[in-house]
């Protein structure tokens, strides 16, 4: 079996984690993706996801978590907020293929949120959830989610697809060239 | 359409290994879904005991994560579990399933597809 | 492991009554919540997932609400085929997934 990677970012609490993660095939531009969380010893958790299919350019916000599929750079930009300590974790960005696994895209990230502000250049002190507030109309909540303690969610909608026949199926095969850059405001 | 069906010894002795064998058709088990097992002793509820993905990643119920091994036999569209050092609680119909996970899945999760279930009892 | 309790264990109706059936979780599971049917000797049916998405060729007499830790189980018009035992389940901690103790639906 492939060893999973990790890789570490440490912020302070009020930084914002941005993440880019490029799946540059175009195949996979419209494509359901999600950003999760990975408990110790548990299934991961859906924390947002795009819609489906993903829209271009289309923000979707879910608490203090931001989605936003860019199909012409072949990214998914995920950026988490006004950081808290208790944020500290594991995490990954996944294309959606059910009913086959989520295909994961790049290193894990494990994030780690300390107390207090570095002061550093870039550092984005300020980052409230207010500096990233979208407006109404395109705040969505569109996957069962995972509610933690400072991340208000909303219930997904009524499905009334019934994807639990292969037809839904997407085939991920020979996903090449995957790099993922790591953006700090 | 999809069918599991179970197979196995029904009577195993106390401080044995159980073991149990879940052929599912109409679905080629190296399409996706989790493939699980579940328990009912007699009447009482519903025990999920673990399941496997194709590739061989598995999820346990931590109760029993000690004594359970569930493998997967992708050329023979097939799935089976080894419950070690049983004891007269490990008495049950066992059920294999079809799984699919929420974090898999956006817009449907749950057990969609059962076998008919197997009785095992545990006595000497 | 999140523990959840169903509510009744048992209860009694009538064809065409309508019935309740609820299942608390010891803590919040957002809406990780399904629903199944278990007749005697018969493996167990789904019915709603993801506490109120009917399954495909379920009847629309089903219906499921609820979230955090309260959920809602209704059949608006009790058929003679869902005489049954009612089981919740989360999938929300997991492992282990869960299931409630189940509330066995009697003829009255």
């Known amino acids: 079996a492939t060893k999973l990677t990790e890789e570490k970012y440490e912020l302070k609490e009020g930084q914002t984690l941005d993440v880019k993660c490029d799946y540059t095939l175009e195949k996979f531009a419209s494509s359901q993706k999600a950003w999760q969380i990975i408990r110790d010893g548990e299934m991961p958790k859906t924390l947002a996801c795009t819609e489906r299919p993903s829209k271009n350019s289309h923000p979707v916000q879910v608490g203090r978590i931001i989605l936003e599929d860019y199909h012409d750079h072949g990214l998914l930009r995920v950026r988490m907020v006004n950081l808290q300590v208790e944020d500290s974790g594991l995490y990954q960005c996944v294309i959606y293929q059910p009913p086959k696994e989520p295909h994961m895209l790049f290193d894990r990230i494990r994030l780690v949120v300390t107390k207090g502000f570095s002061g550093t250049p870039g550092s984005n002190e300020n980052s409230t959830q207010n500096v990233y507030k979208i407006p109404p109309t395109t705040t969505k909540a569109l996957c069962p989610l995972y509610t933690s303690p400072r991340t208000v969610t909303q219930a997904p909608p009524k499905s009334t697809a019934d994807v639990s026949t292969p037809d839904s199926e997407i085939n991920l095969t020979n996903v090449t060239d995957i790099i993922r850059v790591p953006v700090f405001n | 359409q999809v069918q599991l069906q179970e197979s196995g010894p029904g009577l195993v002795k106390p401080s044995e290994t159980l073991s149990l064998t879940c052929a599912v058709s109409?679905?080629?088990?190296?399409?996706?879904?989790?493939w699980g097992w579940i328990r009912q002793p007699p009447g009482k509820g519903l025990e999920w005991i673990g399941s496997?993905?194709?590739?061989?990643?598995?999820y346990y119920n931590p109760s029993l994560k000690s004594r359970v091994t569930i493998s997967v036999d992708t050329s023979k569209n097939q799935f089976s579990l080894k419950l070690s050092s049983v004891t007269a609680a490990d008495t049950a119909v066992y059920y294999c399933?079809?799984?699919?996970?929420?974090?898999?899945?956006?817009?449907?999760?749950?057990?969609?597809?059962w076998g008919r279930g197997t009785t095992v009892t545990v006595s000497s | 492991d999140i523990q959840m309790t169903q509510s009744p264990s048992s209860l009694s109706a009538s064809v065409g009554d309508r019935v309740t059936i609820t299942c608390r979780a010891s803590?919040?599971?957002?809406?990780?919540l399904n629903w199944y049917q278990q007749k005697p000797g018969k493996a167990p049916k789904l019915l709603i997932y993801?506490?109120?998405s009917l399954q495909s060729g379920v009847p629309s007499r089903f219906s499921g609400s609820g979230s955090g830790t309260d959920f809602t189980l209704t059949i608006s018009s009790l058929q003679p085929e869902d005489f049954a035992t009612y089981y919740c389940?989360?999938?929300?901690?997991?492992?282990?997934?869960?299931f409630g103790g189940g509330t066995k639906v009697e003829i009255k």
């Open positions: 993801a506490a109120s």
């Open positions: 399933a079809r799984e699919l996970y929420a974090y898999s899945s956006p817009m449907f999760y749950g057990m969609d597809v």
């Open positions: 389940q989360q999938l929300y901690h997991a492992p282990p997934i869960t």
């Open positions: 496997i993905y194709h590739s061989g990643n598995t």
């Open positions: 803590q919040s599971i957002s809406r990780y």
């Open positions: 109409g679905y080629s088990i190296s399409s996706g879904y989790y």
